[in-house]
Interface confidence: medium
């Protein structure tokens, strides 16, 4: 059967005015997963997103992550979504005073 | 697929305010993005804004900035427009629509309610 | 603003003609993420708009494949290879690639 990620979106100062939102799946079975920002509800284009490789992550499911740079105060418009085994998700960059945000998609 | 049902027709008086409903069913609600989008009688169609029903996230045509505030409310799976300092000219039919950004798709306005109409007359 | 122009106003056919509208945009409509999202809607006297094209030439789930859609940069095209009945109405071009996402000023499609 199929082991549905765990996601994770996180963020860290960049530069002066950017911040570095990092979207991570983690404890997914099988490996194959979509994982990427959205801006206004519409992929970004590949040139700027970074990807983590799928790798194993010692429990028989697997990990990777996608994070982008964006303009801080902007955070509202961009999303990470995720597509693994037919189901799919959304999920929000969180807010500046809280740096997690995680939820177990079923 | 699901439904977008609008709320019922309205007559306001010119400065008055107006709050549109559009209640939605059958699909994911905080996963989606909503538009609301204008037509007067007779003429084309103008996207007004979106909102994001996941955290109320929004972006607006500058043109309704003004006019239009967007708001959401995930317990009851609704969504609402704000319009305010009505005149004449506001008056139209406003639909709120689904985007559809799964997959591959990538459609802006892929299911739409039925519209409600707005007349403002003194 | 990303202004719209489409051509004809109105289009006269007999059912079972191939129709063909335009659609103009003032600038090239692709978004910085590589994709053209030009899209095509119709809408029927009294009712909503309902999307039969995206991207440019992507039918929406439903629709039959005697709509096609086609071009790139800043012409594009929507054919209807047999027109019935039930395709006659008002037809817009929307570009959703530069904001405010904006649309064409619509083509109605009826009987000769």
């Known amino acids: 059967g199929s082991v549905p990620p765990m996601v994770n979106v996180t963020r860290s100062e960049a530069s002066e005015g950017n911040i570095t939102v990092t979207c991570r799946a983690s404890s997914f079975y099988p490996r194959n997963i979509t994982l990427t920002w959205r801006q206004d509800g519409v992929s970004l284009s590949h040139d700027t997103q970074q990807w983590g490789d799928v790798l194993p992550d010692g429990n028989g499911t697997y990990q990777t992550w996608v994070a982008t740079r964006i303009c801080q105060g902007e955070e509202q418009r961009f999303t990470c979504y995720m597509e693994h085994s037919g189901n799919h998700s959304t999920h929000p960059v969180p807010s500046g005073n809280s740096h997690h945000h995680h939820h177990h998609h079923h | 697929q699901g439904q977008m049902q609008q709320s019922g027709a309205e007559l306001v008086k010119p400065g008055a305010s107006v709050k549109l409903s559009c209640k939605t069913s059958?699909?994911?609600?905080?996963?989606?993005?909503i538009s609301w989008l204008k037509q007067k009688p007779g003429q084309s169609l103008e996207w007004i804004a979106w909102?994001?029903?996941?955290?109320?996230?929004?972006s607006y045509n500058q043109k309704f900035r003004d006019k239009a505030q967007l708001t959401v409310d995930t317990s009851s799976r609704t969504a609402y427009m704000q319009l305010s300092s009505l005149t004449t000219e506001d008056s139209a039919i406003y639909y709120c629509a689904r985007h559809d950004y799964y997959g591959t798709s990538g459609a802006w306005f892929a299911y739409w309610g039925r519209g409600t109409l707005v007349t403002v007359s003194a | 603003d990303v202004l719209m122009t489409q051509t004809p106003l109105s289009l006269p056919v007999s059912l079972g003609d191939q129709a063909s509208i335009s659609c103009r945009s003032s600038?090239?409509?692709?978004?910085?993420?590589?994709?053209?999202?030009l899209e095509w809607y119709l809408q029927k006297p009294g009712q909503s708009p309902k999307l039969l094209i995206y991207k440019v030439s992507n039918r929406f789930s439903g629709v039959p494949d005697r709509f096609s859609g086609s071009g790139s940069g800043t012409d594009f095209t929507l054919k209807i290879s047999r027109v019935e009945a039930e395709d006659l109405g008002v037809y817009y071009c929307f570009q959703g690639s530069h904001v405010p996402w904006t649309f064409g000023g619509g083509t109605k499609v009826e009987i000769k």
């Open positions: 059958g699909f994911t609600f905080s996963d989606n993005y």
């Open positions: 600038q090239h409509i692709v978004h910085s993420n590589e994709n053209t999202y």
């Open positions: 909102i994001y029903a996941g955290t109320g996230g929004s």
